[in-house]
Amino acid sequence: FERTRSLQDPCSNCPAGTFCDNNRNQICSPCPPNSFSSAGGQRTCDICRQCKGVFRTRKECSSTSNAECDCTPGFHCLGAGCSMCEQDCKQGQELTKKGCKDCCFGTFNDQKRGICRPWTNCSLDGKSVLVNGTKERDVVCGPSPADLSPGASSVTPPAPAREPGHSPQ
């Protein structure tokens, strides 16, 4: 057992927050400022991520964990661990390489990110347009034109009761 222990890598005893220092007989040295090691037995510490420019510090770097960034107001995170920040636009716009551009006629975007999407085509469901679409909002489809013939009620009957937790298909 003793023999096995002596054959073991001495670096395996170095805990997170330290590194195995080859220059000092493989003793465990604390990670220098602005660096970290998140696991034991490491021979180097990793440089802390710096949240610069558009990136804001969400969590400071410690000796055992990297800093975490998010994006400054007017931008949103993209990618694993907020590796990128992307510009927000106004509702009714989409981001292009030419900056934020208004949605083309017939399309809308109700969020500050993402692309403009086509208005719903009510006629595909045999319905009519109840409320026109805008750059910021989709159209609202109403009853089919046939339902709006004289004498026909334009009020949609209540939907059958659904069990809680079930959404319409």
Partner: nanobody, 123 residues
Framework: EVQLVESGGGLVQPGGSLRLSCGAS????????MFWFRQAPGKELEWVAN????????YYVDSVEGRFTISRDNAKNSLYLQMNSLRAEDTAIYYC????????????????WGQGTTVTVSS
């Protein structure tokens, strides 16, 4: 280490000119879209201009179109912003940034930023 370092900021009178530079290191500069952003005191960060990998596509925010020119020198790993006819409202910290991998194909995000250089336009 991937790094962007801006320089060239300073105090200039209205109507004057400045040229900002951004030196890139630690990555293949010519593979990436590059950007200038700015943040005026008390305001949100604003996109100013961007340029594609070979400098053939350039885009500007409306407020600087015709006054500012973005350019790059891939041989020198450098990005530039020539600013003419400067106005008080151009006062800001100017940042150089790199478009993330896949920029303009799948997203419009930026991933590496410099520390910024301050431009003050005042008489």
């Amino acid at each position: 280490e991937v790094q962007l370092v801006e320089s060239g900021g300073g105090l200039v009178q209205p109507g004057g000119s400045l040229r900002l530079s951004c030196g890139a290191s630690g990555f293949t500069f010519s593979n990436y879209w590059m950007f200038w952003f700015r943040q005026a005191p008390g305001k949100e960060l604003e996109w100013v201009a961007n340029v594609n990998q070979d400098g053939s596509e350039k885009y500007y925010v409306d407020s600087v179109e015709g006054r500012f020119t973005i350019s790059r020198d891939n041989a020198k790993n450098s990005l530039y912003l020539q600013m003419n006819s400067l106005r008080a409202e151009d006062t800001a910290i100017y940042y150089c940034a790199r478009g993330g991998e896949g920029y303009s194909d799948s997203h419009y995000g930026t991933d590496v930023w410099g520390q910024g250089t301050t431009v003050t336009v005042s008489s």
